[in-house]
């Protein structure tokens, strides 16, 4: 292309650049639905913000195809555990595309947070964080998902979160 | 604006993107301070640099501003725990702006570490990692606090580390 | 220089910022050689893919020198622990350059995941991640070491992984 | 000022239980671990256990288990030992110890209490 | 368990001279370059005192004639110029497992 084309090109570019995409959504009272779905997110307030992504229904949807770091972060804790020190953690980031009925895995993690616990009636805390870059096509789709999200602990949104920026 | 004011703005954005803001501050033997204050860093010597953001007392202080991932990792362990299997680890990223006289929790961790060390051999070892997305503001800082401090342990920089990169 | 030539760099920049160097490696079987060498990972099937960044026996190798934001996560897992409950396990970012003989540490974190296991027949599960921004030059290589390599769990490329790209 | 108050001297039968405590005073109880020692005649200093007035976790020297009991009063300040069917051996002065702020040494100790165990 | 051994048993030194005293761990009492050692002073009829942790830190309050040092498993404690209020038994204590062990005791007497 002529150096008109090059210039609209760069033009547009830059400003594109300006909203390169990014997303950080934080863990709020609804986000655990029990319903064995993905967790849901705060978009707005606080420090939750989308910018060149939207979201819908607890899925980070893309707009712009590119490679994305992704990441999210949960805070598990509890007093014992429901399954006793057995109890295993999955927490993991999932694809959803037109093109695959089912959701693929993306970056996953599991934890066995509980052996931290001694008895019924001890107190834990522990952290699962994953990141890591994955191609992404317009339209897809990506959440987070927890088993068994009863032992995640929600409360202001700095401890629960999920977000992507491309890269 | 016309064609110039693009030219102009191009060529200066390709300055400022030569030095997209980044840092990666490491852990050293005046890191922790026990004084109830933010950890502090090394800047310069080994891994550690500073590109378009300065440093002030164990901050990281915005000079563009912009979305920025912002991470930390901490390196825990010990021979035992202050409070036994109750001793809980928070480790934090915290917002310093000129607009609020508190610091604002950004990202968040819990942990009980010490449930890793059981029976006669008392040592244990934990990681604590954070990374996420946020708005920062030119003039705002960013620090990072670990309460009990006395479970960090700093070796040689790579353990335990604070970063950013605009995005 | 003049304007031609501050629209070629521009032209320049604008093909190189298509390919901002990127890429994520993923878990396989062939990861675990058993022989004292890093992980090996695959580079192509799946999530895996290298842009503007190549590999050669475990090491992602830059082409293009610059701040690289790196990172790797393990999963660990097991019936046990080999040295039992005392077992450490150190994950680490490793850079090797031409101009020294031994590797650097980057990024490393340890854990005693084992003290999650509160009998030899438990079943234990947990994760370790590294992230970093660090300086590279091209033809400095990163490689990914953990140690004892018995612990680590591989299954699907989801779960132990190792990435990087240009911030 | 930190303070640890033992209770008195006690003569106790073979077979017998006594239970020893342990007041503190002077900083915050629940922030310091609480170690029990004694010191038989002619030995040195020997080490039962371990009590986090936080929690009530206890841990125990291998030798004593089944035999001593570490409990807490937080509402007092108060830590007891137990020690059960007791036997001539045991007889000793028994030191409480606080753990220092680093938790790895006895900076504070009770005055003692001597366990007399004859028949 | 980790056994530890002092020596000598009994040490007579003069006031005013310096006072060397070894204690010997069965293994090493080292993690993440910090040893996990302690000094005791009894005397009788009175508690143990700390004066030295982690093999070489005074503890607040002890007279800067006492030292420490060593690590892995062979540790020193130093009085450089004893005192009459000196004279006792001295104990060494490591941290590093349950159950926690001392030495024996090196009784400091006056020559």
């Known amino acids: 292309d002529g150096p008109a084309g090059s210039w609209e090109q760069l033009i547009q570019e830059r400003r594109s650049h300006e909203v390169n995409p990014a997303a950080h959504l934080t863990g709020a009272n609804s986000s655990l639905t029990g319903s064995g779905g993905p967790l849901l997110w705060e978009t707005q307030l606080g420090l939750a913000f989308l910018r060149g992504l939207s979201y819908h229904d607890g899925a980070l949807v893309v707009t712009k195809a590119g490679y994305y770091y992704i990441y999210s972060k949960v805070q598990l804790g509890g007093v014992g555990c429901p399954l006793g020190l057995a109890s295993t953690i999955t927490h993991g980031l999932y694809k959803r595309t037109p093109r695959y009925p089912e959701e693929l895995e993306l970056l996953v993690s599991q934890q066995s947070p509980c052996g931290r616990a001694t008895s019924s009636s001890r107190v834990w805390w522990d952290s699962s964080f994953l990141g890591g870059v994955v191609h992404l096509e317009a339209g897809e789709e990506v959440v987070v998902r927890v088993l068994d999200e009863r032992l995640v602990r929600l409360r202001d949104g700095t401890r629960s979160y999920f977000g992507a920026f491309m890269v | 604006d016309g064609p110039a004011g693009s030219w102009e703005q191009l060529i200066q954005e390709r300055r400022s993107h030569e030095v997209n803001p980044a840092a990666h501050l490491t852990g050293a033997n005046s890191s922790l301070t026990g004084s109830g204050g933010p950890l502090l860093w090394e800047t310069q010597l080994g891994l550690a640099f500073l590109r378009g953001l300065s440093y002030h007392d164990g901050a990281l202080v915005v000079t563009k501003a912009g979305y920025y991932y912002i991470y930390s990792k901490v390196q825990l362990g010990g021979v035992g725990c202050p409070l036994g299997l109750a001793s809980t680890i928070t480790h934090g990223l915290y917002k310093r702006t000129p607009r609020y006289p508190e610091e604002l929790e950004l990202l968040v961790s819990q942990q009980s570490p010490c449930g890793r060390a059981t029976s006669s051999s008392r040592v244990w070892w934990d990681s604590s990692f954070l990374g996420g997305v946020v708005h920062l503001e030119a003039g705002e800082e960013v620090v990072v606090r670990v309460l009990d401090e006395r479970l960090v342990r700093l070796r040689d920089g790579t353990r335990s580390y604070f970063g950013a990169f605009m995005v | 220089d003049g304007p031609a030539g501050s629209w070629e760099q521009l032209i320049q920049e604008r093909r190189s910022h298509e390919v901002n160097p990127a890429a994520h490696l993923t878990g396989a079987n062939s990861s675990l050689t058993g022989s004292g060498g890093p992980l090996l990972w695959e580079t192509q099937l799946g999530l895996a893919f290298l842009r503007g960044l190549s590999y050669h026996d475990g090491a992602l190798v830059v082409t293009k020198a610059g701040y690289y934001y790196i990172y790797s996560k393990v999963q660990l897992g097991g019936v046990g622990c080999p040295l039992g409950l005392a077992s450490t396990i150190t994950h680490g970012l490793y850079k090797r350059t031409p101009r020294y003989p031994e590797e650097l540490e980057l990024l490393v974190s340890q854990q005693s995941p084992c003290g999650r296991a509160t009998s030899s027949s438990r079943v234990w599960w947990d994760s370790s991640f590294l992230g970093g921004v660090v300086h590279l030059e091209a033809g400095e290589e990163v490689v990914v070491r953990v140690l004892d390599e018995r612990l680590v769990r591989l299954r699907d490329g989801t779960r132990s992984y190792f990435g990087a790209f240009m911030v | 000022q930190v303070q640890l108050v033992q209770s008195g001297a006690e003569v106790k039968k073979p077979g017998a239980s006594v239970k020893v405590s342990c007041k503190a005073s002077?900083?915050?109880?629940?922030?310091?671990?609480m170690n029990w020692v004694r010191k038989a005649p002619g030995q040195g200093l020997e080490w039962i256990g371990r009590?986090?007035?936080?929690?009530?976790?206890?841990n125990y020297n291998q030798k004593f288990m089944g035999r001593v009991t570490f409990t807490v009063d937080r509402s007092t300040s108060t830590v007891y030992m137990e020690l059960s069917s007791l036997r001539s051996e045991d007889t000793a002065v028994y030191y409480c110890?606080?753990?220092?702020?680093?938790?790895?040494?006895?900076?504070?100790w009770g005055q003692g209490t001597l366990v007399t165990v004859s028949s | 368990e980790i056994v530890m051994t002092q020596s000598p048993a009994t040490l007579s030194v003069s006031p005013g001279e310096r006072a060397t005293l070894s204690c010997k761990a069965s293994?090493?009492?080292?993690?993440?370059?910090?040893?996990?050692m302690n000094w005791y002073q009894q005397k009788p009829g009175q508690a143990p005192r700390l004066l030295i942790y982690?093999?070489?830190n005074l503890e607040s309050g002890i007279p800067a004639r006492f030292s420490g040092s060593g690590s892995g498993t062979e540790f020193t404690l130093t009085i450089s110029s004893l005192q009459s209020e000196d004279f006792a038994v001295y104990y060494c204590?490591?941290?590093?497992?349950?159950?926690?062990?001392f030495g024996q005791g090196t009784k400091v007497e006056i020559k």
């Open positions: 110890g606080r753990g220092s702020y680093y938790w790895n040494a006895m900076d504070y």
């Open positions: 002077g900083y915050t109880f629940i922030d310091h671990i």
């Open positions: 009590i986090y007035p936080v929690s009530g976790e206890t």
């Open positions: 293994q090493s009492v080292d993690f993440d370059g910090e040893s996990y």
């Open positions: 982690s093999a070489s």
């Open positions: 204590q490591q941290s590093i497992e349950d159950p926690w062990t």
